[in-house]
C-alpha cells in the first residue's frame, strides 16, 4: 500500500531507535571509509528531516524515495572523490542506477585496520561514559567491516552486546564475565555474516528462482508439518526481506522482517510446533530465534513420493504447465521428508528432476524415459556421505589445527594463485567444518557440513571476484550455486602453476611471534605453509610435515630463549637452509 | 485408480438451494485446482467456479457470482458447490474437473456429472 | 472476458479425412513469463463427459491417439485430426485458462459423412 511519505511511514513502523541504527548500517555499509563522526551527522539529518515528515507528510521532499534521500545525503560527503575514487561516479547517476553503482561498490575486504579489543576497565568507562556512542561505534565498525551483514540481526547483536556490558561492567570480575560473551559475539557475528553474505550472492549472481529455491528446501526441513501453500507464502515474504537487505533497502527489510515473525507466530499452529518458545520473545530476540529453530518432527506416513512425481500420469502436464511450482512441490516433498541431506544436495536432486523431465517430457514414452529417474538420485546422494565419513575420520585422527593444515595443503595445491591470506581464511574456515560438525550424528551431518562449506566457499567466491587470479575458480564459483562444493573438491593438483620463486623475507620470523595468542601463531606458522606449497606444489605430505614439525619447534625453543631476536635471526638462517635442502628447493 | 464422484444433484425450485459434492480419490488432492463445469440440455460447457485446493483461493464466472460459493475438505479428500438462489438458467448438469497446478491448467478428468434442475 | 469463437460450428467428414476446427481468441492467452499458450482442445462424445485432448496449444494429453494435434499460438488456435475415424464422432471444444473467468468456445459437432 502506497505513503505518502516512505520515510514517514519507516520511521512510524520502526520508530526511531531502531531508524537511526538502521540509517547508521545503511550508511556505513555503502561509505566504509567514512569516519564515524561524519556518519552519525549524517544519520542525525536524516533523522531530523524524518520526523518533519511524520509531522506532515506532505512537507517538501517528504514524498522522495528513501534511495533518493539517502542516496541524496551520501552525496554531499565532501570527501567522496579522494575517499572512494571511482564511487563518486555513482553521484552522477539517477534513480535507481545510482544505489545499483552504489551496491557495486561495497567493498568485501576493506583496507581497514584490525579491530583491537580495549582492556576491559576502557571499555567499561567508554560504555558508561556515553552508552549511546559506544554502542552506535560498534555498529558502525561492524557494518563497514561486513556490508552485507543482515542489518535486522545486527540490531539484535547490538542488543546484546549492550546487555553484555551492563550486566559485565558491574560484576566483581568484568573481565571473566565479559570477554566470553565478547568471544561468542565476535564469533556468532562472522558466522551470521558469512551465512547473510551467501544468501546476497544467491539472490544478487543466481537471481530470484535460485533463492527461491534454497528457501522452499530449507523451510520445508524445518516446517515439515507445514502444507505446500503455506511454505510458498513464507518462501515469497521471506525472498522479499532477504531482496531488501541485500539491495540495501534496511529499513523495509527490517520492517517486512517484523511483520514476518508476526506473520508465523499468529500462524504456528499451521506451521511448526517448535516455534511455541520464539514466539513469546521481544521482537528481535524473536525473528533470531524463529530463524534459528530446529526442525518439526515429520508427519507420519507420508506417502511415497513416486505417486506424484514418478507414476501419476500428470507429470509432464504438470511440468510443462507449471514448471516452479511442480518442481517447487517435488523439492517441498523431498526436503520435507530429508533433514538428513543438505540443503544443496536436495537442490541437486530437483535439478537433476528438472532435467530428467526436460529431456523425457519431449521423448516418444515419456514414462517410460522417466521411469527410474529417483535411481538417478542414489550417486548425488553418495557422494556427499562418503566425503563427510572420510573427512570427519581425518579430522578425529588429526585434531583441528593439523586438520586445517591439511585442507591448506590440499587447497593451496588446487588453486596455488589465490592470495595467502585468502587461502588461509578459507582453509581455517573449512577445517572448522571438523569440530562444528563431526561431533553430530550420522542424520545431522550432511545438513551441518555440506550446509556450511557453501557458506566458507562463497567466501573465497567474493573475495575471488574482487580481485580474479584464478580461472577455476572463477569457473567453480559461476557455473552452478548448488555444485560449488563438488566442482571444489574435484579439483586435482593445478598442473599449469609455475612454483613461486624462493624469497627468504617470507620465511624469516621474529620474537614478537612469542607474544601472540595462540590463534595468532597458528595463523604465522599456516601462512608459512601455504608459501611453501606455493613454493614447492609438488612436496609430499611427508616432506611438508617435516618441515612444519622442524619450524614449530624452532618457534618454541626461540620463545624460550633468553635473546629470542638472536636466536629467531640465527636459528631462522639454519631452518631455511635445512627446509630447502629437505624440499630440494 | 482416478475418481471423481459428483453428487447432490436434484429437483429445486427457483430460489432454493443445493450443495453438491465431489469426492476425489487416487491423486493428491490438495495439490490441484478443482473445478465446477456445467452444461445446459443442447448447450456447451460453462466453467462455473475454480479452487486451489492448497491455498483456498476461489474464482467465480459472473453469472453465479455472489450466489455460489466453492470450497473444499482436504481432509475427506472432497469438493463442494453450494448453490443458493437458484435460476432456472442454473438448470444442467454439473461436472467435477480436476484442473493442474495452476489456475489455466487443462482439466485432465472430469467426473460422470450430477443433474440440476431449478424448475417451479 | 475473454471470448472464445469456434469455427465451423460443424463439420461431416468421412473415415481417413482430415478435419481441422478452428479457435479464435479476443484477446492474446500467450503468457509473457514462460511463452505459452493457456489453450486446450476436449472432446466430448455422446451422452458422455468430455476429455482433455489438447493443452498449452499443441501438448498432447497422455493416451490420445497421435492423428489429434492442435497448434497455433496468441490468438489463433487449430485443431487437427489428421485421418478421422468412426470414435472420433463428438463436439469439440476450445478453452483458455489465460485469464479468470475461464472460458470455453461454443463448441464445433463433427459427425461421420
Known amino acids: 500500500d502506497a505513503h505518502k511519505s516512505e520515510v514517514a511511514h519507516r520511521f512510524k513502523d520502526l520508530g526511531e531507535e531502531n531508524f537511526k541504527a538502521l540509517v547508521l548500517i545503511a550508511f556505513a555499509q555503502y561509505l566504509q571509509q567514512c569516519p564515524f563522526e561524519d556518519h552519525v551527522k549524517l544519520v542525525n539529518e536524516v533523522t531530523e528531516f524524518a520526523k518533519t515528515c511524520v509531522a506532515d507528510e506532505s512537507a517538501e521532499n517528504c514524498d522522495k524515495s528513501l534511495h533518493t534521500l539517502f542516496g541524496d545525503k551520501l552525496c554531499t560527503v565532501a570527501t567522496l572523490r579522494e575517499t572512494y575514487g571511482e564511487m563518486a561516479d555513482c553521484c552522477a547517476k539517477q534513480e535507481p542506477e545510482r544505489n545499483e553503482c552504489f551496491l557495486q561498490h561495497k567493498d568485501d575486504n576493506p583496507n581497514l585496520p584490525r579491530l583491537v579489543r580495549p582492556e576491559v576497565d576502557v571499555m567499561c568507562t567508554a560504555f558508561h561514559d556515553n552508552e549511546e556512542t559506544f554502542l552506535k561505534k560498534y555498529l558502525y565498525e561492524i557494518a563497514r567491516r561486513h556490508p552485507y551483514f543482515y542489518a535486522p540481526e545486527l540490531l539484535f547483536f547490538a542488543k546484546r552486546y549492550k546487555a553484555a556490558f551492563t550486566e559485565c561492567c558491574q560484576a566483581a570480575d568484568k573481565a571473566a564475565c565479559l570477554l566470553p560473551k565478547l568471544d561468542e559475539l565476535r564469533d556468532e557475528g562472522k558466522a551470521s555474516s558469512a551465512k547473510q553474505r551467501l544468501k546476497c550472492a544467491s539472490l544478487q549472481k543466481f537471481g530470484e528462482r535460485a533463492f527461491k529455491a534454497w528457501a522452499v528446501a530449507r523451510l520445508s526441513q524445518r516446517f515439515p508439518k507445514a502444507e505446500f501453500a503455506e511454505v510458498s507464502k513464507l518462501v515469497t515474504d521471506l525472498t522479499k526481506v532477504h531482496t531488501e537487505c541485500c539491495h540495501g533497502d534496511l529499513l523495509e527489510c527490517a520492517d517486512d522482517r517484523a511483520d514476518l515473525a508476526k506473520y508465523i507466530c499468529e500462524n504456528q499452529d499451521s506451521i511448526s510446533s517448535k516455534l511455541k518458545e520464539c514466539c513469546e520473545k521481544p521482537l528481535l530476540e524473536k525473528s533470531h530465534c524463529i530463524a534459528e529453530v530446529e526442525n518439526d518432527e515429520m508427519p507420519a506416513d507420508l506417502p511415497s513420493l513416486a505417486a506424484d512425481f514418478v507414476e501419476s500420469k500428470d507429470v509432464c502436464k504438470n511440468y510443462a504447465e507449471a514448471k516452479d511450482v511442480f518442481l517447487g512441490m517435488f523439492l517441498y516433498e523431498y526436503a520435507r521428508r530429508h533433514p538428513d541431506y543438505s540443503v544443496v544436495l536436495l537442490l541437486r536432486l530437483a535439478k537433476t528432476y528438472e532435467t530428467t523431465l526436460e529431456k523425457c517430457c519431449a521423448a516418444a514414452d515419456p514414462h517410460e524415459c522417466y521411469a527410474k529417474v529417483f535411481d538417478e538420485f542414489k550417486p548425488l546422494v553418495e557422494e556427499p556421505q562418503n566425503l563427510i565419513k572420510q573427512n570427519c575420520e581425518l579430522f578425529e585422527q588429526l585434531g583441528e589445527y593439523k586438520f586445517q593444515n591439511a585442507l591448506l595443503v590440499r587447497y593451496t595445491k588446487k588453486v596455488p594463485q589465490v592470495s595467502t591470506p585468502t587461502l588461509v581464511e578459507v582453509s581455517r574456515n573449512l577445517g572448522k567444518v571438523g569440530s562444528k560438525c563431526c561431533k553430530h550424528p550420522e542424520a545431522k551431518r550432511m545438513p551441518c557440513a555440506e550446509d556450511y562449506l557453501s557458506v566458507v566457499l562463497n567466501q573465497l567466491c567474493v573475495l575471488h571476484e574482487k580481485t580474479p587470479v584464478s580461472d577455476r575458480v572463477t569457473k567453480c564459483c559461476t557455473e552452478s550455486l548448488v555444485n560449488r562444493r563438488p566442482c571444489f573438491s574435484a579439483l586435482e593438483v593445478d598442473e599449469t602453476y609455475v612454483p613461486k620463486e624462493f624469497n627468504a623475507e617470507t620465511f624469516t620470523f621474529h620474537a614478537d611471534i612469542c607474544t601472540l595468542s595462540e590463534k595468532e601463531r597458528q595463523i604465522k606458522k599456516q601462512t608459512a605453509l601455504v608459501e611453501l606449497v606455493k613454493h614447492k606444489p609438488k612436496a609430499t605430505k611427508e616432506q611438508l610435515k617435516a618441515v612444519m614439525d622442524d619450524f614449530a619447534a624452532f618457534v618454541e625453543k626461540c620463545c624460550k630463549a633468553d635473546d629470542k631476536e638472536t636466536c629467531f635471526a640465527e636459528e631462522g638462517k639454519k631452518l631455511v637452509a635445512a627446509s630447502q635442502a629437505a624440499l630440494g628447493l | 485408480e482416478l475418481q471423481l464422484v459428483e453428487s447432490g444433484g436434484g429437483l429445486v425450485q427457483p430460489g432454493g438451494s443445493l450443495r453438491l459434492a465431489c469426492a476425489a480419490s487416487?491423486?493428491?488432492?490438495?495439490?490441484?485446482?478443482m473445478h465446477w463445469v456445467r452444461q445446459a440440455p443442447g448447450k456447451g460447457l460453462e466453467w462455473v467456479s475454480g479452487?486451489?485446493?492448497?491455498?483456498?483461493?476461489?474464482a467465480y464466472a459472473d453469472s453465479v457470482k455472489g450466489r455460489f460459493t466453492i470450497s473444499r475438505d482436504n481432509g475427506k479428500n472432497t469438493l463442494y458447490l453450494q448453490m443458493n438462489s437458484l435460476k432456472s438458467d442454473d438448470t444442467a448438469v454439473y461436472y467435477c474437473?480436476?484442473?493442474?497446478?495452476?489456475?489455466?491448467?487443462?482439466?485432465?478428468?472430469w467426473g460422470q456429472g450430477t443433474q440440476v434442475t431449478v424448475s417451479s | 472476458d475473454i471470448v472464445m469463437t469456434q469455427s465451423p460450428s460443424s463439420v461431416t467428414a468421412s473415415a481417413g479425412e482430415k478435419v481441422t476446427i478452428n479457435c479464435k481468441s479476443s484477446r492474446s492467452v500467450l503468457y509473457s513469463s514462460n511463452q505459452k499458450n493457456y489453450l486446450a482442445w476436449y472432446q466430448q462424445r455422446p451422452g458422455q463427459s468430455p476429455r482433455l485432448l489438447i493443452y498449452l496449444a499443441s501438448t498432447r494429453e497422455s493416451g490420445v491417439p497421435d492423428r489429434f494435434s492442435g497448434s497455433g499460438s496468441t490468438t489463433d488456435f487449430t485443431l487437427t485430426i489428421s485421418s478421422f475415424q468412426p470414435e472420433d464422432v463428438a463436439v469439440y471444444y476450445c478453452?483458455?485458462?489465460?485469464?479468470?473467468?475461464?472460458?470455453f468456445g461454443q463448441g464445433t459437432k463433427v459427425e461421420l459423412k
Open positions: 478453452q483458455q485458462g489465460y485469464d479468470v473467468p475461464v472460458t
Open positions: 474437473a480436476k484442473g493442474g497446478l495452476v489456475v489455466g491448467g487443462g482439466y485432465s478428468d
Open positions: 479452487i486451489n485446493t492448497g491455498t483456498g483461493s476461489t
Open positions: 487416487g491423486f493428491t488432492f490438495s495439490r490441484y485446482w
